[in-house]
Interface confidence: low
């Protein structure tokens, strides 16, 4: 169907003439509001058919929709029709006249409905009001249809302003009719199955006794029909179920299974769909990964979580340094794997009050006959720093040697500092950092050892003071991400007797 001019909408001047032509390979005609207006039909020389609709001396009353349709059963698609809409802005006409039965609007459930007040000019602002209240309602307006929304049982009027006069429409009455709404639920025993396994889908309707079930499913395309079983589940409310069962699924059974339910008494209906995937083999795949190194803090609890997807249900094992882990009776270690959706799993390892000995390499493995995944990471247990020892010695060459030893994880940093004014030190005077100075007054040497069995670093820092000529307060401070620790010692010159 071809309309010229093509539209789909025209705004015509009042009193003008307008010609519409519809052409097709089969006989066609124009319809307006289910009426057949006067028109000229012709068969063209090239074998096509056309119908010409001439609108002369148009008025606001010509505003509306026009359809070009096939006028007999020869049309290639009987239901096919083309629509155009014509506006004829007419300042003398407010709202288009309505048949009295169209002023009563019956709504059978909470669905969108239309209050069909229409104007001739698409530029007019139109508002909807409850008849008793003058406040405009916020409802979308379509100049071709009217107000579209969900309306309560009330009386309504439409208003517009043409020039400087306010124009009201007829009164519309909305009535709700109570009918039992259809509530359909569709569920599958499994939405993912391996080929050869069975597919079972249930479609259940509550509170309606006379219903019709209609299924559509992938097998229908190849003409292989499956006979559903209807199941009456008596009780309050009553339930009727239709069960579609395919005992041996094939890959081609993947797709959408739709259950359409209709109630013959009131033309009500509802449909629900569910997707089923048939797979060749089972699978396991990680959905999230973890950093290679995971951190736990000494004596704090730590949960490590792995999220994966699998079908069928896999077995899950956790290993530490290649040894299988199991829930400990002392409650120091808890393993759990939860099925959070049909094919999604979360496996958790919880270490309660982490010990240094729990540092090491961990692996989670999820597996079944068809597939497996594993995820490994290193668990590092962070330990607060401790200064274990701060000692001094006096070799014969007159130097003062200070040795500071401490431990922690991760590796601690060492900072030496000194304070000369003992009375004001350390609260009122910030200490001076010490290190390898160019004047060679001090020399610093630090050695770091990683103790494998303790899974922590030991730092030994030696500070040589070449020349001490007055008492000094010297502090050794160790610091890592877990905190800091320090010790102080007072160093006196060789020659100076010092009493505390």
């Amino acid at each position: 169907l071809v309309i010229t001019p093509p539209g789909p909408e025209f705004v015509l001047n009042i009193s003008s003439t307008f010609v519409l032509t519809c052409s097709s390979s089969a006989p066609v005609m124009w319809e307006q509001m289910s009426q057949v207006p006067w028109q000229e039909a012709a068969m063209n020389q090239d074998g096509t058919f056309s119908s010409v609709l001439t609108l002369t001396n148009v008025t606001g009353g010509d505003t509306g929709e026009y359809f070009c349709v096939y006028n007999n059963s020869l049309g290639p698609e009987l239901s096919e029709r083309k629509r155009i809409y014509i506006f004829v802005p007419d300042p003398t006409m407010g709202f288009l006249p309505m048949d009295s039965e169209d002023l009563f609007i019956f709504v059978t459930d909470v669905t969108e409905t239309t209050i069909p007040c229409r104007v001739t000019d698409p530029q007019l602002e139109v508002t909807l009001h409850e008849k008793k209240v003058d406040i405009p309602l916020h409802v979308p307006y379509d100049h071709q249809r009217g107000f579209i929304g969900t309306f309560e049982d009330k009386t309504y009027i439409c208003k517009t302003t043409i020039g400087d006069r306010e124009v009201d429409s007829d009164t519309y009455y909305v009535y709700s009719l109570q009918v039992s709404s259809i509530n359909v639920s569709v569920n599958a025993v499994q939405t993912v199955v391996r080929q050869g396994e069975s597919i079972t889908i249930r479609c259940i309707v509550m509170g309606n006794d006379v219903v019709n079930f209609q299924w559509t499913y992938p097998r229908m395309k190849s003409g292989r029909l499956v006979e559903p079983v209807t199941d009456y589940l008596f009780g309050v409310p009553s339930r009727i179920g239709s069960i579609l069962h395919i005992p041996t699924a094939e890959l081609s059974d993947s797709g959408t299974y739709t259950c359409n339910v209709s109630v013959s008494v009131n033309d009500h209906g509802d449909e629900k769909a569910i997707n089923v995937t048939v797979i060749e083999n089972g699978y396991v795949r990680l959905l999230e990964t973890l950093e290679d190194v995971q951190i736990a803090e000494l004596h704090r609890s730590r949960t490590l979580q792995v999220v994966f997807e699998a079908y069928p249900t896999p077995s899950v094992l956790w290993f530490k340094d290649n040894r299988t882990l199991g829930d400990s009776s002392a409650g120091e270690l808890v393993l759990s794997t939860r099925n959070v959706s049909e094919t999604r799993y979360v496996s958790e390892l919880t270490l309660v009050r982490v010990k240094v000995s729990e540092a090491g390499y961990y692996t989670m493995r999820a597996f079944h006959a068809d597939d497996q995944v594993q995820l490994s990471f290193k668990l590092q247990v962070n330990v607060p720093v401790r200064v274990l020892e701060l000692s001094e010695s006096h070799p014969a060459n007159g130097e003062q040697i200070l040795r500071c030893r401490g431990r922690g994880m991760p590796q601690p940093n060492v900072t030496w500092s000194t304070c000369r004014d003992l009375k004001r030190c350390p609260r009122k005077l910030s200490p001076t950092p010490l290190g390898n100075s160019s004047k060679e007054e001090s020399q610093l040497e630090t050695n770091v050892t990683f103790w494998e069995e303790d899974q922590e670093y030991e730092v030994v820092s030696t500070l040589r003071l070449r020349h001490v000529d007055q008492p000094l307060s010297v502090r050794c401070m160790l610091q890592n991400s877990m905190g800091r620790d320090s010790q102080e010692v007072t160093v006196v010159p060789h020659s100076l007797p010092f009493k505390v």
Partner: nanobody, 122 residues
Framework: EVQLVESGGGLVQAGGSLRLSCAAS????????MGWFRQTPGKEREFVAA????????HYADSVKGRFTISRDHAENAVFLQMNSLKPEDTAVYYC???????????????WGQGTQVTVSS
Amino acid sequence: EVQLVESGGGLVQAGGSLRLSCAASGRSFSSSVMGWFRQTPGKEREFVAATRWTAASTHYADSVKGRFTISRDHAENAVFLQMNSLKPEDTAVYYCAAGNYLDTAQYRYNYWGQGTQVTVSS
């Protein structure tokens, strides 16, 4: 004050799809036609598609017919443009527009969005 806010633009390969959304907000919004236009640097804004509230009437530019679909959501006061089988020549800034005439002419539309960039690479 009516505001139109577009989203959903981006970079896509030729043959791919994108869905543009345009949300209309404002204390009162009574335009019954919403549409999409597009513009490439140095060229006029070009009509793409438009629809009335009910989507009973829709209109498409010949260059996008069969590939683009315009739809609306009353509840959300929104219009969508589903763009399939995208071509490099669809690359443009896409603007959402609102008015009361279902028309291809820009001047028929009272409200405009800021635009969203769509780039189709070959």
